[in-house]
C-alpha cells in the first residue's frame, strides 16, 4: 500500500532509499524539451516474486519539438499519494542492492530523464538520512525513517538526527553509532521490512561507499 506523505524533512539533511520495496512507483519524467513517447509507460513499478525483484516498464523520452512544456505524469487516483521528488544531479546506479529480498535497486537512468525523480513509496519502505556537506550529524537514535501503517493510516517515523553547522561531513547513513541501533524486524514468509541481516547488509554497503558516491540527492 502506498504511503500518504513524504518522509520527514530534517534541516540540513538529505535522505536516500538503499533499495525500493516491491510496489514502489517511479514516475517517467522527461527533461525540458522532451516528453514521454506516445503510449509510453507512466511509471516504472518495482515488482517481483520471493526470489527476484525488478522494475517493470521502461521510461522513454522523445523530443517534444513542437511542444515547449514537459508533460507531467499524473498518477491514477489510487496512486495519488506519495510523490517524493529526488534530484538527479548525475544519475548513477548505487552499489548492488539485489541482496535485499522483495526490493529493487535504484533504476538506471534513461535517456533525457528529468533532473528530478518522483517516487511513490509503499508501506514498509525505509529511508536513511545524512547531513548535507558542511553539517555534522548528532544522533539521538537511528538516522532512518520507516513508513508504517495501521488499517489504511500511514505515517513516517521521525528520524533521530540533528545536523549541526560544523564544517564536517558524515558518512551515509551516519558516522556516529546510534545509541539504540534498530533491532531486527521479525521475519516471516512475506515480511516487507528490513531484517537485522538486511540492515547489516545496508550498513556495510553504506560504510564501504564514499560520500561522493551519493550523487542522487533527496531534497
Amino acid at each position: 500500500e502506498l504511503c500518504d506523505d513524504d518522509p520527514p524533512e530534517i534541516p540540513h539533511a538529505t535522505f536516500k532509499a538503499m533499495a525500493y520495496k516491491e510496489g514502489t512507483m517511479l514516475n517517467c519524467e522527461c527533461k525540458r524539451g522532451f516528453r514521454r513517447i506516445k503510449s509510453g509507460s507512466l511509471y516504472m513499478l518495482c515488482t517481483g516474486n520471493s526470489s527476484h525483484s525488478s522494475w517493470d516498464n521502461q521510461c522513454q523520452c522523445t523530443s517534444s519539438a513542437t511542444r515547449n512544456t514537459t508533460k507531467q505524469v499524473t498518477p491514477q487516483p489510487e496512486e495519488q499519494k506519495e510523490r517524493k521528488t529526488t534530484e538527479m544531479q548525475s544519475p548513477m546506479q548505487p552499489v548492488d542492492q539485489a541482496s535485499l529480498p522483495g526490493h529493487c535497486r535504484e533504476p538506471p537512468p534513461w535517456e533525457n530523464e528529468a533532473t528530478e525523480r518522483i517516487y511513490h513509496f509503499v508501506v514498509g519502505q525505509m529511508v536513511y538520512y545524512q547531513c548535507v556537506q558542511g553539517y555534522r550529524a548528532l544522533h539521538r537514535g537511528p538516522a532512518e525513517s520507516v513508513c508504517k501503517m495501521t488499517h489504511g493510516k500511514t505515517r513516517w517515523t521521525q528520524p533521530q538526527l540533528i545536523c549541526t553547522g560544523e564544517m564536517e561531513t558524515s558518512q551515509f547513513p551516519g558516522e556516529e553509532k546510534p545509541q539504540a541501533s534498530p533491532e531486527g524486524r521479525p521475519e516471516s514468509e512475506t515480511s516487507c521490512l528490513v531484517t537485522t541481516t538486511d540492515f547489516q547488509i545496508q550498513t556495510e554497503m553504506a560504510a564501504t561507499m564514499e560520500t561522493s558516491i551519493f550523487t542522487t540527492e533527496y531534497q
Epitope: E1, K21, E22, G23, E78, G102, V123, G124, V146, K148, M149, T150, H151, G152, K153, R155, T157, Q158, P182, E183, G184, R185, P186, S188, T190, S191, C192, L193
Partner: antibody
Framework: QAYLQQSGAELVRSGASVKLSCTAS????????IHWVKQRPEQGLEWIGW????????EYAPKFQGKATMTADTSSNTAHLQLSSLTSEDTAVYYC??????????????WGQGTLVTVSA | DVVLTQTPLSLPVSLGDQASISCRSS???????????LEWYLQKPGQSPKLLIY???NRFSGVPDRFSGSGSGTDFTLKISKVEAEDLGVYYC?????????FGGGTKLEIK
C-alpha cells in the same frame, strides 16, 4: 521472531487504577502501531485503541475514552495500558497486539499472552 | 460505530465437513483508500487470537489453504473446506476500515 510479553495478572480493588505492560522483542515498537483489546470472561473481543509509540499519538474507542490511557516507552520497547476508576465491568483479559504489515498483508499478526485484571469489591 | 453481526453463534460440525461463517456489517467497510480491512481471527480456548485472513480473502502466512475468505461491501464469509480438530475454537471477524475498529460477536466452531 516477533514476540509480545505482557505483565502478570492483577487483583485490584474497585475504584483503584492499574497499569499493564507489553514488552516487544524481535522488532522495534516505534516502527509499528500497538493496539489493545479487551475480553471479558466468556465474552467476545473489544477494541480499546492504538498508540503510535514513535510520537505518542493515540486513538481510542469512544467507550474507553477516560477509562483507558495508552503510553509507550521506546527505550524499553514497551507499551502500557492504564485503567482507572476500576469497576467489576473492567474485570477482563487485556491483550496487546501489533498491526503487522508485509508486501501484501496486514493485520494483528502477533499478540501478547494477555493480562487478567480482576476487580474486587 | 460499525456493527459486525456474525452468524451462526454456534456451529456444530463433524470433522471433515465444510464450515461456513457469515459476517455482516451495518455499513460498507470499504476504506477511503479503496481497501477493505476485513480480517478473520481464530481464538482457541485459553489462547490469544490468531490472524487467519486479512483484507477479506488473503490467507496469512502459515494458514492452511482449507481456510478461505470472500465477500464485499457488507457481506463476508469465512469457509473451512474440511474441518480438522485443530480448527475448533471461536472465530471473530474484524473491520479496521472505520474508526473505531470493531469485532464481530464471534462464532463457536464445535464438534457435533
Amino acid at each position: 521472531q516477533a514476540y509480545l510479553q505482557q505483565s502478570g495478572a492483577e487483583l485490584v480493588r474497585s475504584g483503584a487504577s492499574v497499569k499493564l505492560s507489553c514488552t516487544a522483542s524481535g522488532f522495534n515498537i516505534k516502527d509499528y502501531y500497538i493496539h489493545w483489546v479487551k475480553q471479558r470472561p466468556e465474552q467476545g473481543l473489544e477494541w480499546i485503541g492504538w498508540i503510535d509509540p514513535d510520537n505518542g499519538e493515540t486513538e481510542y474507542a469512544p467507550k474507553f475514552q477516560g477509562k483507558a490511557t495508552m503510553t509507550a516507552d521506546t527505550s524499553s520497547n514497551t507499551a502500557h495500558l492504564q485503567l482507572s476508576s476500576l469497576t467489576s465491568e473492567d474485570t477482563a483479559v487485556y491483550y496487546c497486539t501489533v498491526f503487522w504489515y508485509g508486501n501484501n498483508y496486514a493485520g494483528f499478526a502477533y499478540w501478547g499472552q494477555g493480562t487478567l485484571v480482576t476487580v474486587s469489591a | 460505530d460499525v456493527v459486525l453481526t456474525q452468524t451462526p453463534l454456534s456451529l456444530p460440525v463433524s470433522l471433515g465437513d465444510q464450515a461456513s461463517i457469515s459476517c455482516r456489517s451495518s455499513q460498507s467497510i470499504v476504506h477511503s483508500n479503496g481497501n477493505t480491512y476485513l480480517e478473520w481471527y481464530l481464538q482457541k480456548p485459553g489462547q490469544s487470537p490468531k490472524l487467519l485472513i486479512y483484507k477479506v480473502s488473503n490467507r496469512f502466512s502459515g494458514v492452511p489453504d482449507r481456510f478461505s475468505g470472500s465477500g464485499s461491501g457488507t457481506d463476508f464469509t469465512l469457509k473451512i473446506s474440511k474441518v480438522e480438530a485443530e480448527d475448533l475454537g471461536v472465530y471473530y471477524c474484524f473491520q479496521g476500515s472505520h474508526v473505531p475498529p470493531t469485532f464481530g460477536g464471534g462464532t463457536k466452531l464445535e464438534i457435533k
